[in-house]
């Protein structure tokens, strides 16, 4: 079957995000991928969206992330914009209202996004073949 247009949009956004280095991409988020053996694909997407939403809600106006220079400010704003877009698209793909995120494990946002990109690319290669 054809790949969902949302999936392509997610991969495009993740490509942009993983190229970015900002003051806050080294901050930690809940690592939902650490123990996701018994988790459905939809649950994984829903939980990933939840983690991203928690991150940008908490750090959108964080002065440490906004930095002191214009470049740092704009890079952070761009990061938040992409995270919101990713969050929106992941919810669309998940089709779930809510999902629990209880893991204790942490990873940097940078590593979290790289892992998510790998998962999305694998999904894309399956649906496009």
């Amino acid at each position: 079957h054809k790949c969902d247009i949302t999936l392509q949009e997610i991969i495009k956004t993740l490509n942009s995000l993983t190229e970015q280095k900002t003051l806050c991409t080294e901050l930690t988020v809940t690592d939902i991928f650490a123990a996701s053996k018994n988790t459905t694909e939809k649950e994984t997407f829903c939980r990933a969206a939840t983690v991203l939403r928690q991150f940008y809600s908490h750090h959108e106006k964080d002065t440490r992330c906004l930095g002191a220079t214009a470049q740092q400010f704009h890079r952070h704003k761009q990061l938040i914009r992409f995270l919101k877009r990713l969050d929106r698209n992941l919810w669309g793909l998940a089709g779930l209202n809510s999902c629990p995120v209880k893991e204790a494990n942490q990873s940097t946002l940078e590593n979290f996004l790289e892992r998510l990109k790998t998962i999305m690319r694998e999904k894309y290669s399956k649906c496009s073949s």
Epitope: S16, Q71, H74
Partner: antibody, heavy 123, light 107 residues
Framework: QVQLQQSGPQLVRPGTSVKISCKAS????????IHWIKQRPGQGLEWIGM????????RLNQRFKDRATLTVDRSSSTAYMQLRSPTSEDSALYYC????????????????WGAGTTVTVSS | DIQMNQSPASLSVSLGDTITLTCHAS??????LSWFQQSPGNIPKLLIY???NLHTGVPSRFSGSGSGTGFTLTISSLQPEDIATYYC?????????FGGGTKLEIK
């Protein structure tokens, strides 16, 4: 082509309010911050502030924080600047300009400017 | 706020001259500097961004250099259309600030 079209000249009374517009065309309006610049007759340029058309977030120069309001109307790709309680010091040419960025802000600059709106404050 | 100082404030020139305008920042701005040209009655026109990058369509007789706190704009073989006021602008941190300008006048 990329254009910023500003509203016409305005004559306003001291202590009232003035609102000028800047209509964008030829590019994705929500992708670039719009900045506002003031130029008094025969003088230099002064940065007033900026607005992100995608979400309406603003950042203002402290000197204008209490009197300037920046807004956007995404449906018409138009940015607005309102100046409250103007005095003769506010008689100036006001420009809107777009902040163009490349490579995740590896470089950025004002590449396109509106023609400017002349505001005259007089009783 | 970062202060930007330009010198000289005005300069008497002859067509064909090579001239250098200077801009000094009150603190380190790395290479976050733009140069603009403004002819009487016209809008500012971007010439140089990030200290030394020539904007699209700008003649190669314009060149910029510098980093940190000291910057220069050089115009070689001055043409009639170059008679204008030149402004530097720092893009290092908000609020963005401009120099007072250097006005070119024909001798």
């Amino acid at each position: 082509q990329v254009q910023l079209q500003q509203s016409g000249p305005q004559l306003v009374r001291p202590g009232t309010s003035v609102k000028i517009s800047c209509k964008a065309s030829g590019y994705s309006f929500t992708s670039y911050w719009i900045h506002w610049i003031k130029q008094r007759p025969g003088q230099g340029l002064e940065w007033i502030g900026m607005i992100d058309p995608s979400d309406g977030e603003t950042r203002l120069n402290q000197r204008f924080k209490d009197r300037a309001t920046l807004t956007v109307d995404r449906s018409s790709s138009t940015a607005y600047m309102q100046l409250r309680s103007p005095t003769s010091e506010d008689s100036a040419l006001y420009y809107c300009t777009r902040l163009k960025e490349y490579g995740n802000y590896d470089s950025f600059y004002f590449d396109v400017w509106g023609a400017g709106t002349t505001v005259t404050v007089s009783s | 706020d970062i202060q930007m100082n330009q010198s000289p404030a005005s300069l008497s020139v002859s067509l064909g001259d090579t001239i250098t305008l200077t801009c000094h920042a009150s603190q380190n701005i790395d290479v976050w500097l733009s140069w603009f040209q403004q002819s009487p009655g016209n809008i500012p026109k971007l010439l140089i961004y990030k200290a030394s990058n020539l904007h699209t369509g700008v003649p190669s007789r314009f060149s910029g250099s510098g980093s940190g706190t000291g910057f220069t704009l050089t115009i070689s073989s001055l043409q009639p259309e170059d008679i204008a006021t030149y402004y530097c602008q720092q893009a290092h941190s908000y609020p963005f600030t401009f120099g007072g300008g250097t006005k070119l006048e024909i001798k």
